[in-house]
């Protein structure tokens, strides 16, 4: 058994351009806290997989308010170490995730708002009992500087915390085959780490963590004598009256509570009061639980379905991740049809539809001409999600309600004069020009640029524009 310790030194903008904005402001003061998740081995595991080696949350840091105009400095950090106790051997190779969280402290009556600022991850080799290892990790524009180590809890020693050290029984030397425990030269290495609490007199082990009983003893820690006949005393056998081997122990003898839990007797058995970070009947399970408040963004925390997952965050729509920390980009699924614009409002999706389309996802193609009347003999033409009226001669406007002045646009070229006519307009051309809009010059030899003048019209006559 032992403890992984993480010391955060600084969290702030990384070097180079593009310094991040301060996460806090005068209007929204905030404070930081950190979460560490440890997994054995060097596997590239997803962030959502269980923190099998354990996890820890830091305390909240001091409240920080940005100074207007100042660049984001290194942000004030929580006091103390993040400690992740481990019950079994230290694996030597491990993967870590360190998350930096921001807690906004605005005037939200319903409690603080949390958001993930940065997440760094890595895979490392580390021997227990070694010195602090320093590390720098970058996440986007942020930089996290930290140190970490793994240390064994006495009496365990060694690079994996699997060897036990005991005070010397003789002043000068250790027992046969046992070495002194460096650096504790006054202690001797014990052969194997049996299960915590395994009776040294009546139990032994051939593998670390097990407790096998000598003949005549039983129980998970080999502290319960096997009786030769039925034993009536509720506290166990009493040798004189029942023929049992020896007086039996109380339920707390040998302290069945692991990881520093304290044992108290109950009428039926025993009860362990666990230190923070541990739970279970014998305080044998470590890691974050619902009581630590691991879910964000309105997630609800329930117990995991199997013993390895201490909690599950049930995320509301729009969020995902093991802690509901990731906002789902629901617009990336392109839910809006027919070119509609997608807006993720957090609590809901909205589609802003192009003209001519409607419905929650712009799925309805409106009949542009339905209920649209074009006045004065105009006809409705659908197109591009909007209706348009093709107006009869002499009328204009969106619905053909306006009487058009056909001469307003000065349609007659080369100084021709325009006359409004019941069926359109007529251009009276200046000398030397002809055509419906007086657009063709008359050649000096009398031939025109047109192949032939319509019958009954001489060059120079007014041309009617039909």
């Amino acid at each position: 058994a032992g403890v992984f310790e993480l010391q955060i030194h600084s969290f702030g903008p990384g070097p180079g351009p593009g310094a991040p904005r301060s996460p806090c402001s005068a209007r929204l003061p905030c404070r930081l806290f950190f979460r560490v998740c440890l997994k054995p081995g060097l596997s590239e595991e997803a962030a959502e997989s269980p923190c099998a080696l354990g996890a820890a949350l830091s305390a909240r840091g001091p409240v920080y308010t940005e100074q207007p105009g100042a660049p984001a400095p290194d942000l004030p950090l929580p006091d103390g170490l993040l400690q992740v106790p481990f019950r079994d051997a230290w694996p030597g190779t491990f993967s870590f995730i360190i998350e930096t969280w921001r807690e906004e402290l605005g005037d939200q009556i319903g409690g603080p708002a949390w958001s993930l600022l940065a997440r760094v991850a890595g895979r490392r080799r580390l021997a227990a009992g070694g010195p602090w290892a320093r590390d720098i990790q970058r996440a986007g524009a942020w930089e996290l500087r930290f140190s970490y180590r793994a240390r064994c809890e006495p009496p365990a020693v060694g690079t994996a915390c699997t060897r036990l050290c005991r005070p010397r029984s003789a002043p000068s030397r250790c027992g046969p085959g046992l070495r002194p425990c460096a650096p504790l030269e006054d202690e001797c290495e014990a052969p194997l780490v049996c299960r915590a609490g395994c009776s040294p007199e009546h139990g032994f082990c051939e593998q670390p963590g097990e407790c096998r009983c000598l003949e005549g003893w039983t129980g998970p820690l080999c502290t319960v004598p096997v009786s030769t006949s039925s034993c009536l005393s509720p506290r166990g056998p009493s040798s004189a009256t029942t023929g049992c081997l020896v007086p039996g122990p109380g339920p707390c003898d040998g302290n069945p509570c692991a990881n520093g839990g304290s044992c108290s007797e109950t009428p039926r058995s025993f009860e362990c009061t666990c230190p923070r970070g541990f739970y279970g009947l014998r305080c044998e399970v470590s890691g974050v639980t619902c009581a630590d408040g691991p879910c964000f963004n309105g997630g609800l925390c329930v117990g995991g379905a199997d013993p390895d997952s201490a909690y599950i965050c049930h995320c509301p729509p729009g969020f995902q991740g093991s802690n509901c920390e990731k906002r789902v980009d629901r617009c990336s699924l392109q839910p809006c049809r027919n070119g509609g614009l997608c807006l993720d409002l957090g609590h809901a999706l909205r589609c802003r539809c192009r003209a001519g389309f409607a419905g929650p996802r712009c799925e309805h193609d409106l009949d542009d001409c339905a209920g649209r009347a074009c006045a004065n003999g105009g006809t409705c033409v659908e197109g591009g999600g909007a209706h348009r009226c093709s107006c009869a001669l002499g009328f204009g406007g969106r619905d053909c309600r306006e009487r058009a002045d056909p001469c307003a646009a000065r349609p007659c070229a080369h100084g021709g004069r325009c006359y409004a006519h019941f069926s359109g307009l007529v251009c009276a051309c200046a000398p030397g020009y002809m055509g419906a809009r007086c657009e063709f010059p008359v050649h000096p030899d009398g031939a025109s640029a047109l192949p032939a003048a319509p019958p009954g019209l001489r060059p120079g006559d007014p041309q009617r524009y039909l």
Epitope: G110, G111, C290, G293, P294, V302, G303, H347
Partner: antibody
């Protein structure tokens, strides 16, 4: 201060529906789940379901899944619980309660005063 | 569903004495266990969350312990206002379930 104020007592006939309201004040309404719990006369507490006001998403007790509808009106900070196909055994006091929610805590920290629904022919 | 069983159904204790209320789950609820107090004609009131976490405004004489399937609510020195019905509730899995309650009455 946090308050949950529920609508008044109702008397309904078997087969009918009842809609109970719960108006919240004193906290950010959209940030906390609201749960519904009922208590039959002289009996214990029974969880019916929850609603998250910001999105309207719900968790339901399977026992009531086809009969309970929970809705909300964010403009008035009110949640509603409608129970249909009423039977005599639905006679109970119906409570709404605010769930702490912060950090995922699935714990009911503030309760409404309760609404007595009596189902009788 | 997880069945929560409270014992005893009724507990008679004198004011000033210690009261111990028990709650047992049909399967492990880890530490997802909460305690409520209810007085006649009133809504329940949260006393303890997550086995032993205190609630602001709740007197320190209320404490909780246990884990897994066995839980205890202890009232160290009973006051007259403590006589009520007490419920445990698990939030380990759906549906959320409550114990049947322990009525604490004056001896």
């Amino acid at each position: 201060q946090v308050q949950l104020v529920q609508s008044g007592a109702e008397v309904k006939k078997p087969g009918a529906s009842v809609k109970v309201s719960c108006k919240a004040s004193g906290y950010t309404f959209t940030s906390h789940w609201i749960t519904w719990v009922r208590q039959a006369p002289g009996q214990g507490l029974e969880w019916m379901g929850d609603i998250y006001p910001i999105s309207g998403s719900t968790n339901n007790n399977e026992k009531f899944r086809n009969r309970v509808t929970m809705t909300r009106d964010t403009s008035t900070s009110t949640v509603y619980m409608e129970l249909s196909s009423l039977r005599s055994e639905d006679t109970a006091v119906y409570y709404c309660a605010k769930i702490i929610t912060v950090g995922g805590a699935y714990v009911m920290d503030y309760w409404g005063q309760g609404t007595l629904v009596t189902v009788s022919s | 569903e997880i069945v929560m069983t409270q014992s005893p159904a009724t507990l008679s204790v004198s004011p000033g004495e210690r009261a111990t209320l028990s709650c047992r789950a049909s399967q492990s609820v880890r530490n997802n266990l909460h305690w409520y107090q209810q007085k006649p004609g009133q809504a329940p009131r949260l006393l303890i969350k997550y086995v032993s976490q205190s609630i602001s405004g709740i007197p320190a004489r209320f404490s909780g312990s246990g884990s897994g399937t066995e839980f205890t609510l202890t009232i160290s020195s009973l006051q007259s206002e403590d006589f009520a019905v007490y419920y445990c509730q698990q939030s380990n899995s759906w549906p959320l379930t409550f114990g049947g309650g322990t009525k604490l009455e004056i001896k």
